[in-house]
């Protein structure tokens, strides 16, 4: 059947459409276009015999059609008179006639839409505001947006005029929005620009910053006022119900007690013509004296002296309040307080118990601090340490020692050679020692202020020789995949290079392998059973050489899965059952049989003489060793066969 | 897209032929007439008629028919016009034009250029 | 045979500017008027029909107006790619004829 397809339908103002034709009959004479929805020879468009290649214009011919061979016709610059039906008339090579009819509508194109409102600045809870969309436009569907988004569900919003005005009712300040609204058409859309909606509103109760009431006499009074307000409210300050100053801020310096009283702010909106008051009752306290802080021992020893700390003035009614380190005070059976907390016992203080110490009197305001107070604890002198560690010298160099001991007040230092006083210096220098110069090196640390005296003695000896080295070890007996082992060369010697042996060779390259300590120390990580072997330290400088004794690391392992022997799982009735467990470790381990499920004897073979087919079952070997708390086991399946009922059984042990 | 593309340049001798083609591409051939416009040096363009490129039956003007003719290979897509007993007045660039079915013309070859020289 | 009168034959404009070219027919031609513009070594190039519809992809600083026998072709804000003789044509009857061509220089 002979169609007509508009394209597009609905065509804008300027543009073009093609009406297309489908299913145009084969053999044709010509055919005619008309404007309308049938044949009139007064609105002809166009007529084309296909014969002639020659079109012929009719009256209804505006010069802004083609027609194409295959009957299709083109309407250009399109005019709004232009909508409407189009009927094409074919007559086929036979004069039989055909005719079909189509349509299309036309729009303008539609310009950008603007936004009046009757009401530039509502009031909010009292005006409405109606928005119209402008120009009014046939055939064009309105459309509102606000802040960019679709028209909200509200009963205070209101469309009418076919969309075309937007009315808000009872205007908020929520209601100051971007508003916008668009005109569409089937062939164009258009937004307006945004209008903002400037809603007057409040004052609010206005409230005043900050919010605490209490000062101290001295301070000074800075409050500010707002109130939530379009356009923004003027304030005004009043004091005891008397005006001060028309400032959004009220700034008094240097309050007294006599500031105390009411405070008003009073917000004004000039175009609501609103006003609304806020009070604040201000109060001024008279200034406490600052804390301090005695105490009745100035001087403590540690572990033998208690401390009472007092903070001074008495005050009565009052809070006191105690801080260490800047820290609230930590719970300890130590420290003690007294009833009114005024006074801080420390009990047998040590030199940790420092501070500082601050307390704190605590007003209707604020707390007020004392100065920090510390503690001079006296301790000591500890256990002296001398320094250098080594103890064996080369003759012609010198040999510089020197003491230390913690200790308050800093402990005096005396030194002694084989009990004999040398000198009282923190560090003994001689020079170009000889072997005679070997012996029992003596520090003693005296504190003149506790009377306490420490020693620390130390053995140095000169020689030229090296002497033999020994090994000492961390651990004598490390267990296998998880202990580590550090090995270390004694003694420690100037100038000396240090070396190791393990079974007679030099050090394998191994990741579980490390070297420290200027060599002195060998650390094995995470050691395992092969590292059970004979180890040698070495030492030398330029004119000797020595090694060490081997020792033999002691490596616990195991136990590892058991085997049971022999291996037959197959017997003949009336032979012996012996089964032999073996499994690694080290020490060796603990042996415990099962017999389906029911223990057995604590031996490493089990033997049953004359098994009978009762004896079938699970047989488990269970090991433990009680140095590395591993546990292991195996099970074993046996069958007993009645004699001779199958070949090749096993007679037995 | 429609195209139109003539061939190349010639130079005769009086009392020659010459056969200049108009290849046709980008619609359906027959549907459409095909016109031919002559151009001589320094003049302006002269409309010498047409070929009804459905039925073959060409149309000339009065200034042009005797030794001028129109002609088509249909299947080539191709009008030709050929001059028979060339005269120094036929030098001129030839022009072949497709004509709209209301008659006209809305695209162009580039020309061919016909020199006549003894 | 219609006969065309076209004028001016040639003439000079400045860039920006505006020219007009008048075609009169010895008949009324009722609108088949078409207007070309054709440049050396190329084909002419259709840019109006029927008097003054612009054909597509031809920029608006072209347009056409007139009927009966007076027709008019205009060009405003010149340009330089303008620079083409420009040819009136009438395609009322079956025998068509050109104007005589006007040369335009900028």
């Known amino acids: 059947k002979l169609t007509i397809e508009s394209t597009p339908f609905n065509v804008a103002e300027g543009k073009e459409v093609l009406l297309l034709v489908h299913n145009l009959p084969q053999h044709l004479f010509g055919y005619s276009w008309y404007k309308g929805e049938r044949v009139d020879g007064n609105r002809q468009i166009i007529g084309y015999v296909i014969g002639t290649q020659q079109a012929t214009p009719g009256p209804a011919y505006s010069g802004r059609e083609i027609i194409y061979p295959n009957a299709s016709l083109l309407i250009q610059n399109i005019i709004q008179n232009d909508t409407g039906f189009y009927t094409l008339h074919v007559i086929k090579s036979d004069l039989v006639n055909e005719e079909a009819t189509g349509q299309f509508r036309v729009y303008p194109e539609l310009p950008k839409p603007s936004i009046s409102s009757n009401n530039s600045k509502p009031v909010e809870d009292k005006d409405a505001v109606a928005f119209t969309c402008e120009p009014e436009t046939q055939d064009a569907t309105y459309l509102w947006w606000v802040n960019n988004q679709s028209l909200p569900v509200s009963p205070r919003l209101q469309l009418s005029n076919g969309n075309r005005t937007l009315t808000l009712f009872n205007v908020t300040r929520n209601d100051t929005a971007s508003y916008k609204c668009e005109t569409q058409n089937p062939v164009s859309a258009r937004r307006s620009d945004s209008v903002i909606l400037n809603v007057l509103y409040g004052p609010d109760a206005p409230t005043i910053s900050p919010l605490n009431t209490s000062y101290r006499s001295g301070e000074n009074l800075n409050l500010s006022c707002h109130a939530a307000s379009n356009p923004p409210a003027q304030y005004s300050w009043f004091v005891n119900g008397t005006f001060q100053q028309s400032t959004q801020e009220l700034f008094i310096p240097n309050i007294t007690v006599n500031n105390s009283g009411s405070y008003t702010c009073q917000a004004h909106n000039s175009d609501t013509g609103l006003n609304r008051t806020t009070v604040t009752t201000i109060t001024v306290y008279a200034e406490p004296p600052k804390p301090f802080i005695t105490s009745n021992n100035s001087n403590p020893v540690e572990d033998e002296d208690a401390v009472a700390l007092t903070c001074e003035p008495e005050i009565q009614n009052t809070t006191y309040l105690w801080w260490v380190n800047n820290q609230s005070l930590p719970v300890s059976p130590r420290l003690q307080l007294s009833n009114d907390n005024r006074t801080l016992t420390l009990l047998s203080v040590t030199r940790n118990d420092v501070g500082p110490y601050e307390c704190g009197i605590q007003n209707e305001l604020s707390v007020d601090h004392s100065d920090p107070v510390i503690l001079n604890v006296l301790y000591g002198p500890d256990d002296p340490t001398i320094s250098p560690s080594y103890t064996y010298y080369r003759p012609g160099v010198n040999l510089s020692l020197s003491c230390h001991a913690a200790s308050n007040p800093p402990a005096q230092y005396s030194w002694l050679i084989d009990g004999n006083i040398q000198q009282h210096t923190q560090e003994l220098f001689i020079s170009n020692i000889t072997e005679k110069n070997s012996g029992l090196y003596t520090c003693q640390a005296n504190n003149s202020a506790s009377g306490h005296s420490r020693t620390t003695v130390k053995t140095i000896t000169v020689s030229a020789e090296l002497p033999k080295p020994s090994i000492s070890s961390n651990n004598s007996k490390p267990v296998e995949d998880k202990d580590a082992v550090a090995f270390t060369c004694e003694p420690e010697a100037q100038n000396t290079t240090y070396l190791w042996w393990v079974n007679g060779q030099s050090l394998p390259v191994s990741p579980r392998l490390q070297l420290s300590n200027g060599n002195r120390t060998l650390t094995l990580f995470n050691v395992t059973r092969n590292d059970a072997r004979a180890y040698v330290c070495g030492i030398q400088n330029s004119v000797s050489a020595n090694r060490s004794d081997p020792v033999t690391l002691d490596v616990l392992y195991g136990p590892d899965t058991p085997i049971i022997s022999p291996p037959d799982s197959s017997y003949l009735s009336g032979a012996n059952l012996n089964l032999s467990c073996h499994s690694a470790s080290n020490p060796s381990p603990q042996y415990s049989w099962r017999i389906n499920g029911i223990p057995q004897q604590h031996t490493q073979v089990l033997f049953i003489a004359k098994i009978t087919p009762n004896n079938n079952g699970t047989y488990a070997c269970f090991v433990s060793n009680l140095a590395t708390g591993r546990n292991n086991s195996i099970v074993k399946s046996i069958t007993v066969s009645a004699s001779g009922t199958s070949p090749g059984l096993s007679a037995g042990a | 897209q429609i195209q139109l593309v003539q061939s190349g340049p010639e130079l005769k001798k009086p009392g020659e032929t010459v056969k200049i083609s108009c290849k046709a591409s980008g619609y359906t051939f027959t549907t459409y007439g095909m016109t031919w416009v002559k151009q001589a040096p320094g003049k302006g363009l002269k409309w010498m008629g047409w070929i009804n490129t459905y039925s073959g039956v060409p149309t000339y003007i009065d200034d042009f028919k005797g030794r001028f003719a129109f002609s088509l290979e249909t299947s080539a897509s191709t009008a030709y016009l050929q001059i028979n007993n060339l005269k120094n007045e036929d030098t001129a660039t030839y022009f072949c034009g497709r004509k709209d079915l209301l008659g006209f013309m809305d695209y162009w070859g580039q020309g061919t250029s016909v020199t006549v020289s003894s | 045979d219609i006969q065309m009168t076209q004028s001016p034959s040639s003439l000079s404009a400045s860039l920006g500017g505006k020219v007009t070219i008048t075609c009169k027919t010895s008949?009324?031609?009722?609108?088949?008027m078409a207007w070309y513009q054709h440049k050396p070594g190329k084909g002419p190039r259709l840019l109006i029909r029927?008097?003054?519809t612009l054909q597509p992809g031809i920029p608006s600083r072209f347009s056409g107006s007139g009927s009966g026998r007076d027709y008019s072709f205009s060009i405003r804000n010149l340009e330089p790619e303008d620079i083409a003789t420009y040819y009136c044509?009438?395609?009322?009857?079956?025998?068509?004829?050109f104007g005589g061509g006007t040369k335009l220089e900028i």
């Open positions: 044509l009438q395609y009322d009857d079956l025998t068509w004829t």
């Open positions: 029927y008097t003054s």
């Open positions: 008949q009324d031609i009722n609108k088949f």
